[in-house]
């Protein structure tokens, strides 16, 4: 049994890091493998993660951690019984994938303005809370070409757009994702999408 693709890990910079790897053949990850991880810190202890299958030869493990700080470094040991298959390390702050924003809501009752709001996925005491920026994706269910991205580079989790920038009388969907420039993170997953019917009063044309 050998590791074909070494574990790569990403952290949500809160409580979970996710590591994925591939074996050289079909593997029952949960029964054959164990990933041991240990914070390099005074009086820390090794913790065991039981991996799950992620495709035939792929494995994934969700590592539970204390809230993360930038200096944290973890040692990782991948075991198959008594055989050490791979040894490495992981610095969560250098491999951050933020949590996805939640509670995306479209408020359509503000005089021809669409107000989209969502929730920051981090508690106020987490470093990322004040460092997230967002991308909002809006698309038409009827017209695949009607697909747009709005970059929200301010901290407030909201976006205002004129309803007239979208077509009237049709349904739209929106979703939002987050990233943090300070840690050069990857983008989060998209939030669940929300749907609304876009309708607004066409301005009266004078001739």
């Amino acid at each position: 049994m050998k590791v074909l693709q070494e574990p790569t890990c990403v952290s949500d910079y809160m409580s979970i890091s996710t590591c994925e790897w591939k074996m050289n053949g079909p593997t029952n990850c949960s029964t054959e493998l164990r990933l041991l991880y240990q914070l390099v810190f005074l009086l820390s202890e090794a913790h065991t993660c039981i991996p799950e299958n992620n495709g035939g030869a792929g494995c994934v493990c969700h590592l539970l951690m204390d809230d993360v700080v930038s200096a944290d470094n973890y040692t990782l040991d991948l075991w198959a019984g008594q055989q050490l298959l791979w040894k490495g390390s992981f610095k969560p702050s250098e491999h951050v994938k933020p949590r996805a924003p939640g509670n995306l809501t479209v408020h359509t009752n503000v005089s021809d303005t669409l107000l989209l709001t969502w929730s920051n996925p981090y508690p106020p005491d987490n470093y990322l809370y004040n460092h997230l920026t967002y991308a909002v994706n809006i698309w038409s269910e009827n017209d695949p070409a009607d697909f747009r991205i709005y970059n929200v580079t301010y901290l407030e989790p909201s976006l205002r757009i004129a309803a007239s920038t979208l077509k009237s009388g049709i349904s739209y969907r929106a979703r939002v994702r987050a990233w943090a420039q300070c840690y050069n993170t990857t983008w989060s997953e998209w939030s669940p999408s929300t749907k609304w019917h876009n309708s607004y009063r066409e301005p009266f044309e004078q001739h």
Epitope: F41, L43, E45
Partner: antibody
Framework: EVQLLESGGGLVQPGGSLRLSCAAS????????MHWVRQAPGKGLEYVSG????????YYANSVKGRFTISRDNPKNTLFLQMSSLRAEDTAVYYC?????????????WGQGTTVTVSS | EIVLTQSPGTLSLSPGERATLSCRAS???????LAWYQQKPGQAPRLLIY???RRATGIPDRFSGSGSGTDFTLTISRLEPEDFAVYYC?????????FGQGTKLEIK
């Protein structure tokens, strides 16, 4: 309420032994690294010893290494410090301390302290 | 072993004034591992700040921490009568725990 209550302090002669206990309540002891910190009369804080959540790893300040032994009984939510070959300079108030996170984040819970006096 | 040196040894100020307490490490340390404690006579120490700048639960916002590398600061923006005490900085790191010798903040 999260609390730590030390006991076992007292007067002991140089070269003697003493065992301090710390009873934890309001939280699960096995989830945290635990420590002992001491303070000699009129002096500052001095780190003494620490132990990992399950007791598999220990750490000692150089001043007590080889003389003190830290241990824990997680099912009984109790921390111990066995002190032997005591010296006059070990005279201090001994505090039992919990760390904020599993391992780190500052010492957020302190006991009221138990006094150890080493004197002939 | 890393040594923490606090200054001044004693600081005499009046209520309402701003207090700035310094803690210098003998070598670079991570901001994640620097904490500050307050101790009043006859009482156990109380955690004020951890991770250099994060306030512990229940600590008023007049207390703030800053710094990096070897130089760290605890600031009390407007001194209240109950703030007069001894303050300790602490390194709680990957391989050791060390306290500074303390700064006594007294009423002028």
């Amino acid at each position: 309420e999260v609390q730590l209550l030390e006991s076992g302090g007292g007067l002991v002669q140089p070269g003697g032994s003493l065992r301090l206990s710390c009873a934890a309540s309001g939280f699960t002891l096995s989830s945290y690294a635990m420590h002992w910190v001491r303070q000699a009369p009129g002096k500052g804080l001095e780190y003494v010893s620490g132990i990992s959540p399950t007791g598999g790893s220990t750490y000692y300040a150089n001043s007590v290494k080889g003389r003190f032994t830290i241990s824990r009984d997680n099912p009984k939510n109790t921390l111990f410090l066995q002190m032997s070959s005591l010296r006059a300079e070990d005279t201090a108030v001994y505090y039992c301390v919990r760390v904020k996170g599993r391992y780190r984040g500052g010492m957020d819970v302190w006991g009221q302290g138990t006094t150890v006096t080493v004197s002939s | 072993e890393i040594v923490l040196t606090q200054s001044p040894g004693t600081l005499s100020l009046s209520p309402g004034e701003r207090a700035t307490l310094s803690c210098r490490a003998s070598q670079n340390i991570s901001t994640a591992y620097l904490a500050w404690y307050q101790q009043k006579p006859g009482q156990a120490p109380r955690l004020l700040i951890y991770g250099t700048s994060r306030r512990a639960t229940g600590i008023p916002d007049r207390f703030s921490g800053s710094g990096s590398g070897t130089d760290f600061t605890l600031t009390i923006s407007r001194l209240e009568p109950e703030d007069f005490a001894v303050y300790y900085c602490q390194l709680y790191g990957t391989s050791s725990v060390t306290f500074g010798q303390g700064t006594k903040l007294e009423i002028k």
